[in-house]
Amino acid sequence: IWELKKDVYVVELDWYPDAPGEMVVLTCDTPEEDGITWTLDQSSEVLGSGKTLTIQVKEFGDAGQYTCHKGGEVLSHSLLLLHKKEDGIWSTDILKDQKEPKNKTFLRCEAKNYSGRFTCWWLTTISTDLTFSVKSSRGSSDPQGVTCGAATLSAERVRGDNKEYEYSVECQEDSACPAAEESLPIEVMVDAVHKLKYENYTSSFFIRDIIKPDPPKNLQLKPLKNSRQVEVSWEYPDTWSTPHSYFSLTFCVQVQGKSKREKKDRVFTDKTSATVICRKNASISVRAQDRYYSSSWSEWASVPCS
């Protein structure tokens, strides 16, 4: 058993039929010695008396809020949560496996630049009685500070009969050095509590590997005289690291016909303009990627040819 926060404890259980469970001793936080009784949750049934209560925790029915009283007055509470281990593996019932980029991916994180700021998100089908707490650091043995905000519900989607909820959190490395080579990864730890079930999820990454620039901005077309060609121009996104001479992007320019089946013409360039042929009813899209490190491409910025 260990303390998650004040008056909240996590009991780690091997979860299999007829498992013996864990013996837990609760102590009432009071100078009183006599006349103390214990109850669980809303029930008025007295479970025991005395300053300590010894219980055998085997299942969710044994978890919950234990309260010690004296003469009708509440003295203290202890909330017991369960962390299940099945076949040697901690349960992952609360979050959905996003399966991207690989199986057992519960947390996904992205950064728009090298400032040390990043966003992580996760999915669940659970809508109520759910809380998340996020901690992060750079390195684990001698951790350097990363500050994370509160996790918030960021999207709700319908998937067949069920809804799916996306939560996200923003974190900022306290002493980020954008130009430095990373040697220790960022560690992100999410504590999830649904009713009386505790689970924890972790992700470890280098900022350079989760970079995904915003799409190029100010995408414009300039027709070239006496030609079907146009000059496409764009700018670096505002959120990208500066100076651009050091934090450089490369770009992919695509001409796409109205039909998805039509052949796509693609041009790769390090410049912020390109000359392409603009077909009728086509659109021109541009996306960006770090020039010197193959992390994710940005989403497309698009304009119609007409």
């Epitope: 949750d41 969710f60 029915g61 809508s127 109520t128 069920n162 909820y165 009713k195």
Partner: antibody
């Protein structure tokens, strides 16, 4: 205690609001549920409204019902009833432990008949 | 999400024992309640958290199970136990909520 009212005979498509009036406890501390039971059939949950006022609905509801509350009442609005909505409608109070809860105080129910 | 109750009806003698099963289509941990309903009356809570007896309910009623399989057992049957019994999952309003189809208990 909990008591439903507003059940009556209505024609299909006529909006109807059922009201659940509570006494002896505060709605700001408990989840409330609306459940219906067609004649001779089982219990079917429609939706719940949390202590904080958030409403959650069964997947089949699709906007046909809306739950809201004041300090002492919980309303169930039937936007466009059909004959299939003929049932006794129950309101019940949760235990106070969770938003998705079990229910230990029930009203006697109010009968809604939808017929042309 | 579905809760399947079996059997749909059962007949037993006074003093006998009845077992009703409730199966969830996904794990709901121990978030299951049992209700008793008599004709013309609202449901009455018997058991919550799969096995905890509600206030004032006789100990002849007992519940067990976790995950997807749950059981309500009524022992030393009395005539007053003739009713329809429902299980209810309260795991989550979106990911596991609702009532079983009911089991009618006839006491002879």
């Amino acid at each position: 205690s909990v008591e439903e009212s507003g059940g009556r005979l209505v024609t299909p498509g006529t909006p109807l609001t059922l009201t659940c009036t509570v006494s002896g406890f505060s709605l700001s501390s408990y989840t409330m549920i609306w459940v219906r039971q067609a004649p001779g059939e089982g219990l079917e949950w429609i939706g719940i409204i949390s202590a904080g006022g958030s409403a959650y609905y069964a997947s089949w509801v699709n906007g046909r019902f809306t739950i809201s509350k004041t300090s002492t009442t919980v309303d169930l609005k039937m936007t466009s009833p059909t004959t299939g909505d003929t049932a006794t409608y129950f309101c019940a109070r949760g235990s106070g432990t969770y938003t998705s809860d079990y229910f230990n105080i029930w009203g006697p129910g109010t009968l809604v008949t939808v017929s042309s | 999400f579905e809760l399947t109750q079996t059997p749909s009806s059962v007949e037993a003698a006074v003093g006998g024992t009845v077992t009703i099963k409730c199966q969830a289509s996904q794990s709901i941990d121990s978030w299951l309640a049992w209700y008793q309903q008599k004709p013309g009356q609202p449901p009455k809570l018997l058991i919550y958290s799969a096995s905890k007896l509600a206030t004032g309910v006789p100990s002849r009623f007992s519940g067990s199970g976790s995950g997807t399989q749950f059981t309500l057992t009524i022992s030393d049957l009395e005539c007053a136990d003739a009713a329809t019994y429902y299980c209810q999952s309260y795991y989550d309003a979106n990911a596991g909520y609702g009532f079983g189809g009911g089991t009618k208990v006839v006491v002879v």
